[in-house]
């Protein structure tokens, strides 16, 4: 039995619905019945959505139950527990999850233009440095002129010397796209920020 936290973007975007997920694997087809119970701070709740078991390539079954949660319950550190009953288990299996403890610290966000040495290439790199945040759960994406971009890679959050975390995000764009003066925005979601969101933009200035 495995329990998974909600997606960071879902927790930090008020209009989305975060879900805690409980997954049971290696269920025998001879004894496929699995019953999920969910608890928030040890109070049972009945709002989970449990999917029909799915057959896996190794002929076992996999069963998934998702509990939609309130953003604040996760951010305020409540504990979510999934209890799984099955005839195949000698006793129910319980798995719990909650947000890491500690005081949230919002990141500082800095954008950096392509280095001039890179301007000989057909593709150039726009970089976003996100530093000083805690906990490490963060969502970083890029936009060009307000439109989401896909050609970027984020490093995993890495612990810094002060116990906070940092990451770098690199967006690849065609050199011409950069030189045309389009606006590139590094957009960051983190619980330590006002409304969980901040963004920093940059664009090419002629003569620079």
């Amino acid at each position: 039995v495995f329990i998974f936290p909600p997606k960071t973007k879902d927790v930090l975007t008020i209009t989305l619905t975060p879900k805690v997920t409980c997954v049971v694997v290696d269920i025998s087809q001879n004894d496929p019945e699995v019953r999920f119970s969910w608890f928030i701070d040890d109070v049972e709740v009945h709002t989970a959505q449990t999917h029909a078991p799915e057959k896996q390539s190794n002929s076992t079954l996999r069963s998934v139950s998702e509990l939609p949660i309130v953003h604040r319950d996760w951010l305020n550190g409540k504990t979510f527990k999934c209890k799984v009953n099955s005839g195949a288990f000698p006793a129910p299996i319980e798995k719990s999850i909650s947000k890491p403890e500690g005081t949230p610290r919002g990141p500082q966000v800095y954008t950096m233009a392509p280095p001039k040495e890179e301007m000989t290439q057909s593709q150039v790199s726009i970089t976003c440095m996100v530093k000083g945040f805690y906990p490490p759960d963060i969502y970083t994406e890029w936009k060009m002129n307000g439109q989401p971009q896909e050609n970027y890679k984020n490093t995993p959050p890495t612990m810094d010397t002060d116990g906070s975390y940092f990451l770098y995000s690199k967006l690849n764009v065609k050199k011409e796209t950069w030189q045309q003066g389009n606006t590139f925005t590094c957009s960051v979601l983190h619980e330590g920020l006002h409304n969980h969101h901040t963004e920093k933009s940059l664009s090419h200035s002629p003569g620079k």
């Epitope: 008020i14 209009t15 989305l16 953003h71 604040r72 951010l75 409304n195 969980h196 969101h197």
Partner: antibody, heavy 117, light 107 residues
Framework: EVQLLQSGPELVKPGASVKIPCKAS????????MDWVKQSHEKSLEWIGY????????IYNHKFKDKATLTVDKSSNIAYMELRSLTSEDTAVYYC??????????WGQGTTLTVSS | DIKMTQSPSSMYASLGERVTITCKAS??????LSWFQQKPGKSPKTLIY???RLVDGVPSRFSGSGSGQDYSLTISSLEYEDMGIYYC?????????FGGGTKLEIK
Amino acid sequence: EVQLLQSGPELVKPGASVKIPCKASGYTFTDYNMDWVKQSHEKSLEWIGYINPYSGDTIYNHKFKDKATLTVDKSSNIAYMELRSLTSEDTAVYYCARGGYDYGDHWGQGTTLTVSS
Amino acid sequence: DIKMTQSPSSMYASLGERVTITCKASQDINSYLSWFQQKPGKSPKTLIYRANRLVDGVPSRFSGSGSGQDYSLTISSLEYEDMGIYYCLQDDEFPRTFGGGTKLEIK
């Protein structure tokens, strides 16, 4: 730059309805709720409710449940509040406000509604 | 509904003076409290959220404190541009509710 642009003043007759638009720009419309607030001389500020533009879900202050209907047009990034069966008590300034996890970081400029025969 | 009682309802203060406005909730609101400033003919502007966090761009002379049912907004040294009406708002429970406002004027 985040902007919420509301329509100009409205003068309507008692018993009529009015639909107030709030045009959002400068952010991803579906990432934030849109709240609506009434400001009248008698009752200061009152929260009417909000709509989630992503899902269309609404939550209303029970006092406004039969008075206001909140909708959105995602294709044009406009939130609407319709007020019905208007009386002189509905005379007020109505604001839209972008609602994130922390309340109301950006507000519209307000729409003044006057109900008079 | 949670009732938010703000005091004083109006006050005069001198430039450079330290000013404190209070807001009392009818029940614990878990620090989900915001403070707004409104100038005549303008929309409210958020100053403080979650009881004590300053919104980016708001001068550091503004600060918020409190927990449970009792909260306060303090202006450490009053400036002319601070006059206006100040409102608190609880965001802990629906319906969200505002305090009645404090009108701050310069002596």
